[in-house]
Amino acid sequence: MMTGTIETTGNISAEKGGSIILQCHLSSTTAQVTQVNWEQQDQLLAICNADLGWHISPSFKDRVAPGPGLGLTLQSLTVNDTGEYFCIYHTYPDGTYTGRIFLEVLESSVAEHGARFQIP
Protein backbone atom coordinates (compact mmCIF):
# COMPACT_ATOMS: atom_id res chain seq x y z
CA MET A 1 0.00 0.00 0.00
CA MET A 2 1.35 3.42 -0.99
CA THR A 3 1.12 5.76 1.98
CA GLY A 4 3.55 8.47 0.91
CA THR A 5 2.76 11.93 -0.37
CA ILE A 6 4.75 14.29 -2.57
CA GLU A 7 4.95 17.95 -1.65
CA THR A 8 6.10 20.32 -4.40
CA THR A 9 6.67 24.00 -4.89
CA GLY A 10 3.43 24.03 -6.92
CA ASN A 11 2.95 26.80 -9.47
CA ILE A 12 5.99 29.06 -9.67
CA SER A 13 7.24 31.88 -11.85
CA ALA A 14 10.66 33.21 -12.70
CA GLU A 15 12.19 35.81 -14.96
CA LYS A 16 13.72 35.12 -18.34
CA GLY A 17 17.48 34.78 -18.03
CA GLY A 18 17.26 33.90 -14.36
CA SER A 19 17.29 30.60 -12.52
CA ILE A 20 14.81 28.61 -10.48
CA ILE A 21 14.96 25.71 -8.05
CA LEU A 22 12.47 22.89 -8.54
CA GLN A 23 11.80 21.05 -5.30
CA CYS A 24 9.81 17.97 -4.37
CA HIS A 25 9.70 16.19 -1.05
CA LEU A 26 8.41 12.70 -0.37
CA SER A 27 6.96 12.22 3.09
CA SER A 28 4.77 9.86 5.13
CA THR A 29 6.52 6.72 3.95
CA THR A 30 9.51 4.65 5.04
CA ALA A 31 10.06 3.39 1.50
CA GLN A 32 13.61 3.57 0.16
CA VAL A 33 14.10 6.07 -2.66
CA THR A 34 16.07 4.31 -5.39
CA GLN A 35 15.89 7.06 -8.02
CA VAL A 36 14.35 10.45 -8.75
CA ASN A 37 13.63 11.48 -12.33
CA TRP A 38 13.17 15.12 -13.27
CA GLU A 39 11.22 15.53 -16.49
CA GLN A 40 9.75 18.38 -18.49
CA GLN A 41 6.64 17.22 -20.29
CA ASP A 42 8.22 14.84 -22.82
CA GLN A 43 11.90 15.31 -21.99
CA LEU A 44 14.21 13.79 -19.41
CA LEU A 45 16.19 16.50 -17.63
CA ALA A 46 18.12 14.55 -15.04
CA ILE A 47 18.08 11.59 -12.70
CA CYS A 48 19.44 11.11 -9.22
CA ASN A 49 20.13 7.41 -8.76
CA ALA A 50 20.98 5.83 -5.41
CA ASP A 51 23.97 4.01 -6.90
CA LEU A 52 25.07 6.29 -9.74
CA GLY A 53 24.33 9.65 -8.13
CA TRP A 54 23.29 12.62 -10.23
CA HIS A 55 23.21 12.34 -13.98
CA ILE A 56 22.17 15.25 -16.21
CA SER A 57 20.84 14.62 -19.71
CA PRO A 58 23.27 15.70 -22.46
CA SER A 59 20.39 17.81 -23.80
CA PHE A 60 20.45 19.98 -20.68
CA LYS A 61 23.96 19.72 -19.22
CA ASP A 62 24.68 23.41 -19.89
CA ARG A 63 21.53 24.70 -18.20
CA VAL A 64 20.70 22.27 -15.41
CA ALA A 65 22.49 21.82 -12.11
CA PRO A 66 21.82 19.12 -9.53
CA GLY A 67 20.38 20.03 -6.15
CA PRO A 68 19.89 21.32 -3.65
CA GLY A 69 19.14 17.90 -2.20
CA LEU A 70 16.98 15.96 -4.62
CA GLY A 71 15.83 19.19 -6.24
CA LEU A 72 16.95 20.61 -9.57
CA THR A 73 18.20 24.06 -10.54
CA LEU A 74 17.29 25.41 -13.99
CA GLN A 75 19.50 28.21 -15.26
CA SER A 76 19.43 30.73 -18.13
CA LEU A 77 15.66 30.45 -18.34
CA THR A 78 13.83 31.16 -21.59
CA VAL A 79 10.11 31.53 -22.24
CA ASN A 80 10.26 28.08 -23.86
CA ASP A 81 10.95 26.65 -20.41
CA THR A 82 7.39 27.50 -19.41
CA GLY A 83 5.40 24.34 -18.75
CA GLU A 84 4.93 21.31 -16.56
CA TYR A 85 7.78 19.63 -14.71
CA PHE A 86 7.55 16.29 -12.96
CA CYS A 87 9.54 14.72 -10.16
CA ILE A 88 9.17 10.96 -10.28
CA TYR A 89 10.27 9.10 -7.17
CA HIS A 90 11.07 5.42 -7.68
CA THR A 91 10.81 3.72 -4.31
CA TYR A 92 11.01 0.27 -2.79
CA PRO A 93 8.70 -1.33 -1.90
CA ASP A 94 6.02 1.30 -2.56
CA GLY A 95 6.56 1.92 -6.26
CA THR A 96 6.40 5.25 -8.08
CA TYR A 97 5.29 8.62 -6.73
CA THR A 98 4.89 11.61 -9.04
CA GLY A 99 4.81 15.33 -8.25
CA ARG A 100 3.95 18.15 -10.63
CA ILE A 101 5.26 21.71 -10.81
CA PHE A 102 4.11 24.36 -13.27
CA LEU A 103 6.75 26.93 -14.17
CA GLU A 104 5.96 30.18 -15.93
CA VAL A 105 8.92 32.12 -17.30
CA LEU A 106 8.17 35.82 -17.57
CA GLU A 107 9.81 38.51 -19.64
CA SER A 108 12.20 40.58 -17.53
CA SER A 109 10.51 43.70 -16.19
CA VAL A 110 11.60 47.00 -17.71
CA ALA A 111 11.51 48.54 -14.26
CA GLU A 112 14.25 46.23 -13.02
CA HIS A 113 16.36 45.71 -16.09
CA GLY A 114 15.58 48.58 -18.46
CA ALA A 115 17.73 51.62 -19.09
CA ARG A 116 17.43 54.42 -16.54
CA PHE A 117 17.18 57.98 -17.84
CA GLN A 118 17.76 61.05 -15.73
CA ILE A 119 15.60 64.04 -16.45
CA PRO A 120 17.62 67.23 -15.97
Partner: nanobody, 116 residues
Framework: EVQLVESGGGLVQPGGSLRLSCAAS????????MGWFRQAPGKERELVAE???????NYADSVKGRFTISADNSKNTAYLQMNSLKPEDTAVYYC??????????WGQGTLVTVSS
Protein backbone atom coordinates in the same frame (compact mmCIF):
# COMPACT_ATOMS: atom_id res chain seq x y z
CA GLU B 1 10.34 -2.81 -17.16
CA VAL B 2 13.11 -2.25 -19.69
CA GLN B 3 15.48 -5.02 -20.72
CA LEU B 4 18.85 -4.34 -22.36
CA VAL B 5 20.76 -6.80 -24.52
CA GLU B 6 24.36 -5.99 -25.46
CA SER B 7 26.50 -7.46 -28.21
CA GLY B 8 29.71 -6.81 -30.10
CA GLY B 9 32.46 -7.26 -27.54
CA GLY B 10 35.58 -9.32 -28.14
CA LEU B 11 39.31 -9.35 -28.63
CA VAL B 12 40.89 -6.76 -30.91
CA GLN B 13 44.42 -5.60 -31.63
CA PRO B 14 45.61 -2.10 -30.68
CA GLY B 15 44.53 0.37 -33.34
CA GLY B 16 41.58 -1.82 -34.30
CA SER B 17 37.85 -1.21 -34.18
CA LEU B 18 34.77 -2.72 -32.58
CA ARG B 19 31.09 -1.83 -32.63
CA LEU B 20 28.93 -2.45 -29.59
CA SER B 21 25.14 -2.65 -29.76
CA CYS B 22 22.56 -2.26 -27.02
CA ALA B 23 18.96 -3.18 -27.80
CA ALA B 24 16.24 -2.04 -25.42
CA SER B 25 12.86 -3.75 -25.14
CA UNK B 26 9.86 -3.49 -22.87
CA UNK B 27 8.68 -0.13 -21.54
CA UNK B 28 10.58 2.04 -24.03
CA UNK B 29 8.35 5.04 -24.67
CA UNK B 30 9.16 8.71 -24.43
CA UNK B 31 12.52 10.37 -24.09
CA UNK B 32 15.59 8.41 -23.07
CA UNK B 33 19.22 8.61 -22.13
CA MET B 34 21.15 5.57 -23.33
CA GLY B 35 24.83 5.19 -22.78
CA TRP B 36 27.85 3.06 -22.21
CA PHE B 37 29.86 2.74 -19.04
CA ARG B 38 32.99 0.67 -18.60
CA GLN B 39 34.79 -0.93 -15.71
CA ALA B 40 38.37 -2.10 -15.86
CA PRO B 41 39.73 -4.54 -13.26
CA GLY B 42 40.35 -2.75 -9.98
CA LYS B 43 38.85 0.51 -11.23
CA GLU B 44 35.53 2.27 -10.76
CA ARG B 45 32.80 2.18 -13.37
CA GLU B 46 33.06 5.26 -15.62
CA LEU B 47 30.86 6.87 -18.24
CA VAL B 48 32.11 6.40 -21.80
CA ALA B 49 29.41 8.00 -23.94
CA GLU B 50 25.69 8.72 -23.91
CA UNK B 51 22.94 9.85 -26.25
CA UNK B 52 19.36 11.14 -25.99
CA UNK B 53 16.38 10.44 -28.24
CA UNK B 54 16.94 13.71 -30.10
CA UNK B 55 20.59 12.85 -30.68
CA UNK B 56 22.41 14.99 -28.15
CA UNK B 57 25.61 13.28 -27.04
CA ASN B 58 28.26 13.42 -24.36
CA TYR B 59 31.67 11.70 -24.27
CA ALA B 60 34.39 11.02 -21.74
CA ASP B 61 37.49 13.04 -22.56
CA SER B 62 39.52 9.85 -22.92
CA VAL B 63 37.45 8.62 -25.89
CA LYS B 64 36.64 11.87 -27.73
CA GLY B 65 37.58 11.64 -31.38
CA ARG B 66 37.89 7.86 -31.24
CA PHE B 67 34.46 6.63 -30.14
CA THR B 68 31.10 7.56 -31.64
CA ILE B 69 27.73 6.87 -30.08
CA SER B 70 24.60 6.72 -32.23
CA ALA B 71 21.07 5.38 -31.96
CA ASP B 72 18.28 4.00 -34.10
CA ASN B 73 15.08 5.18 -32.45
CA SER B 74 12.91 2.86 -34.52
CA LYS B 75 14.80 -0.11 -33.04
CA ASN B 76 15.42 1.38 -29.57
CA THR B 77 19.06 0.46 -30.10
CA ALA B 78 22.22 2.38 -29.28
CA TYR B 79 25.58 1.76 -30.90
CA LEU B 80 29.11 2.53 -29.80
CA GLN B 81 31.63 2.62 -32.63
CA MET B 82 35.10 2.28 -31.10
CA ASN B 83 38.06 3.13 -33.32
CA SER B 84 41.81 3.44 -32.66
CA LEU B 85 41.44 1.17 -29.65
CA LYS B 86 44.16 1.19 -27.02
CA PRO B 87 45.11 -1.40 -24.39
CA GLU B 88 43.74 0.97 -21.73
CA ASP B 89 40.29 0.63 -23.33
CA THR B 90 40.19 -2.96 -22.10
CA ALA B 91 37.21 -3.30 -19.76
CA VAL B 92 33.74 -4.71 -19.33
CA TYR B 93 31.39 -2.35 -21.17
CA TYR B 94 27.90 -1.92 -19.73
CA CYS B 95 24.94 -0.45 -21.50
CA UNK B 96 22.67 1.69 -19.33
CA UNK B 97 19.36 3.33 -20.13
CA UNK B 98 16.67 5.38 -18.51
CA UNK B 99 13.41 5.99 -20.36
CA UNK B 100 10.82 8.61 -19.53
CA UNK B 101 9.36 8.03 -16.05
CA UNK B 102 11.35 4.82 -15.69
CA UNK B 103 14.24 3.60 -13.56
CA UNK B 104 17.84 3.25 -14.64
CA UNK B 105 18.43 -0.17 -16.19
CA TRP B 106 21.78 -1.92 -16.76
CA GLY B 107 22.79 -4.48 -19.32
CA GLN B 108 24.73 -7.61 -18.42
CA GLY B 109 28.04 -6.27 -19.75
CA THR B 110 30.29 -7.29 -22.62
CA LEU B 111 34.05 -7.72 -22.41
CA VAL B 112 36.32 -5.71 -24.70
CA THR B 113 39.96 -6.79 -24.71
CA VAL B 114 42.57 -4.77 -26.61
CA SER B 115 45.76 -6.76 -26.89
CA SER B 116 48.31 -7.87 -29.44
Amino acid sequence: EVQLVESGGGLVQPGGSLRLSCAASGRTFGDYIMGWFRQAPGKERELVAEITRVGNTNYADSVKGRFTISADNSKNTAYLQMNSLKPEDTAVYYCAAVFSRGPLTWGQGTLVTVSS
